[in-house]
């Protein structure tokens, strides 16, 4: 009986036309929501004038429906048993699941000022930037609507540059009508233990953002894993949002709508400094901000963001070193709310429920030549927002899953 079930599972998790896996893989049957909490800065003047601690107050959730679009350009390659695709991006605001509207205002770090002063560190260009910042009446902080902050706005300071430069700025700009990929993943036809594992991303097996093993594209995209998952496994997956591969480890058995699933979590070790976790040495890309690679819990992804000083962390700097959160007041990290987990049905390897949590931060540094940054006496990794992307198998799908998969085994 077990062999027959194994054979059926192996057949049904292959990523090709006609299988259960393929249907749900092309277009997820799960409703996925992305909730945002914005860190509203309460004391912008004091920070700018006196280099005070930044007082933040999170406001949210502001909820969008995401991942509702089917994969595009799905192409099977029979020769190497892979399937390639693009994952289109789309976000629809859900007012009923939000505390306010997309027109709500927030005081946040001036993204363009922080980024330009970091990208152009030479003194002469900083003098020019200062002229443009002053002329445009820009400052260290700005007031922006949620829509602007997330999806883009025309920056008044960048608009003064007399050359063709991108003047639209936004944390997720451009998003709608764009796609992530091309991904090329193994379809599992020849070897089911490789199903959904990424072969190449954007035509490459490496990212070109990191040194050594840190640059590898490992595992799947976390939507599913090869079947027959063991609790002892370390599940590798790649997340383009954080420009790196990462891993999850088994935490506990969970009952999800009558389906036994394994809860895998991202361990604190994954965010540790190389001092504690030597494997992480290649995620430390510079010595100053990282205090000689002793800081932990923040990931400098500037190389993946055209030089913009973007740092990724867990929400509220969960699992981060005290020096990171010390200049920020108003953060309250807790594991339950702020960690990432995947609930995986072990027989099929399907992720039936997940919560992906991350925080977007921007580095801002003092600048002798830029007036609005002149009084800063320290570097700040400024939290802008954190997000919680969640999906749970629907009741109907859960019933089907119970009757066709777990029911047959039990």
């Amino acid at each position: 009986g077990d062999l027959l079930i194994q054979k059926t599972i192996k057949k049904q998790v292959v990523l090709e036309e006609g299988t259960i896996a393929f249907k749900n893989w092309v277009k997820t049957g799960t409703e996925v929501y992305r909730q945002f909490w914005i860190f509203d800065v309460q004391n912008p003047q004091e920070v700018m004038m006196n280099s005070s601690n930044i007082q933040v107050k999170q406001r949210g959730p502001y909820t969008y429906r995401v991942r509702f679009l089917a994969k595009e350009n799905v192409t099977q390659d029979a020769e190497d048993n892979t399937v390639s695709f693009l994952q289109p991006n789309g976000a629809i605001f859900e007012p009923s699941l939000s505390v306010g509207t997309e027109a709500d205002n927030f005081t946040v770090l001036n993204l363009a000022v922080a980024a330009a002063s970091h990208i152009y560190q030479n003194q002469f260009v900083q003098m020019i930037l200062n002229s443009l910042i002053n002329k445009s009446k820009s400052s260290m902080f700005q007031v922006r609507t949620l829509r602007e902050l997330l999806w883009g706005y025309r920056d008044p300071f960048l608009s003064l540059v007399p050359y063709p430069v991108t003047t639209t700025v936004g944390l997720f700009y451009p998003y709608n009508n764009t796609a992530d990929g091309v991904y090329k993943v193994f379809n599992g036809k020849d070897n089911i233990s490789k199903v959904a594992i990424i072969d190449t991303y954007k035509g490459k097996r490496n990212l070109s953002y990191w040194e050594s093993h840190c640059d590898m594209i490992n595992g799947t995209d976390a939507a599913s894993f090869p079947p027959f998952v063991e609790k002892s496994q370390v599940l590798q997956f790649f997340s383009s949002d954080i420009c790196r591969s990462i891993y999850a480890v088994f935490e506990s058995d969970v009952n999800l709508k009558g389906i036994p699933v394994y809860r895998f979590v991202l361990p604190s070790k994954a965010f540790a400094s190389p001092v504690e976790n030597p494997d992480n040495y290649c995620f430390c890309t510079e010595k100053i901000i990282s205090k000689n690679c002793t800081s932990y819990g923040v990931l400098d992804i500037s190389k993946c963001k055209e030089g913009r000083p973007v740092y990724i962390s867990l929400p509220h700097f969960l699992y981060a070193s005290p020096d990171v959160s010390e200049p920020i007041d108003g953060l309250n990290p807790n594991e339950e709310e702020h960690r990432t987990y995947l609930d995986i049905e072990p027989i099929t390897g399907f992720t039936l429920q997940f919560a992906k949590r991350l925080q977007v931060n921007l580095l801002v540094k003092p600048s002798e030549k830029i007036q609005v940054l002149k009084n800063l006496k320290r570097n700040y990794i400024v939290p802008i927002l954190w997000l919680n992307e969640t999906g749970t198998i629907g009741d109907e799908k859960a019933n089907m899953f119970r009757s066709q998969v777990t029911g047959k085994i039990n």
Partner: antibody
Framework: EVQLVESGGGLVQPGGSLRLSCAAS????????IHWVRQAPGKGLEWVAW????????YYADSVKGRFTISADTSKNTAYLQMNSLRAEDTAVYYC??????????WGQGTLVTVSS | DIQMTQSPSSLSASVGDRVTITCRAS??????VAWYQQKPGKAPKLLIS???SLYSGVPSRFSGSGSGTDFTLTISSLQPEDFATYYC?????????FGQGTKVEIK
């Protein structure tokens, strides 16, 4: 077409004054900022002064600080270099040049300033 | 101030020769270096900015390399119209400073 035309050069006695003009066309000087660069006879290039975009600030070489003043009239799209307390070592061809990121992509034809008694 | 030291101060070469001019900055200027060509009685002309970026309209026989403190201008195959004086300039820090020039003469 971008063009820069200098005028106002000539012979002046030591201690005297002169005002150079740089008329720009094909671009807005306030968006870029304007530099003055000089070249003494048979010598190399020396940066003299800069007015930052949007008249933000002015900057000067130490050799001319306190004696020369750079300015711009945006309505005329013209930059000026007011030179006071002129010395023999100020004798040079004076070029105005357009720059944004600090390299000079357009230059005027130059105007000769001779300081001699 | 950042000093830019150019070498050689002059060189003789023939048409078709490969010519290399070097420029050393007294401190790190990253890639913020420009190169100019100047002919007698004329204003300088921009050839290269950001150490390696060829300015539009400049023939591809001109190329720039280097980063930090050491920079090179190369003319892969010298043409009759290339006999002139060449200057490097750092655009990293004010005051902006030039090298003393390299005169390329006909052998």
């Amino acid at each position: 077409e971008v063009q820069l035309v200098e005028s106002g050069g000539g012979l002046v006695q030591p201690g005297g004054s002169l005002r150079l003009s740089c008329a720009a066309s094909g671009f807005t000087i306030s968006s870029f900022g304007i530099h003055w660069v000089r070249q003494a006879p048979g010598k190399g290039l020396e940066w003299v002064a800069w007015i930052a975009p949007y008249g933000g600030e002015e900057y000067y070489a130490d050799s001319v600080k306190g004696r020369f003043t750079i300015s711009a009239d945006t309505s005329k799209n013209t930059a000026y270099l007011q030179m006071n307390s002129l010395r023999a070592e100020d004798t040079a061809v004076y070029y105005c040049a357009r720059s944004f990121f600090g390299y000079f992509d357009y230059w005027g034809q130059g105007t000769l300033v001779t300081v001699s008694s | 101030d950042i000093q830019m030291t150019q070498s050689p101060s002059s060189l003789s070469a023939s048409v078709g020769d490969r010519v290399t001019i070097t420029c050393r900055a007294s401190q790190d200027v990253s890639n913020w270096v420009a190169w100019y060509q100047q002919k007698p009685g004329k204003a300088p002309k921009l050839l290269i900015s950001y150490a390696t970026s060829l300015y539009s309209g400049v023939p591809s026989r001109f190329s720039g390399s280097g980063s930090g403190t050491d920079f090179t201008l190369t003319i892969s195959s010298l043409q009759p119209e290339d006999f002139a004086t060449y200057y490097c300039q750092q655009h990293s820090n004010a005051p902006l400073t030039f090298g003393q020039g390299t005169k390329v003469e006909i052998k």
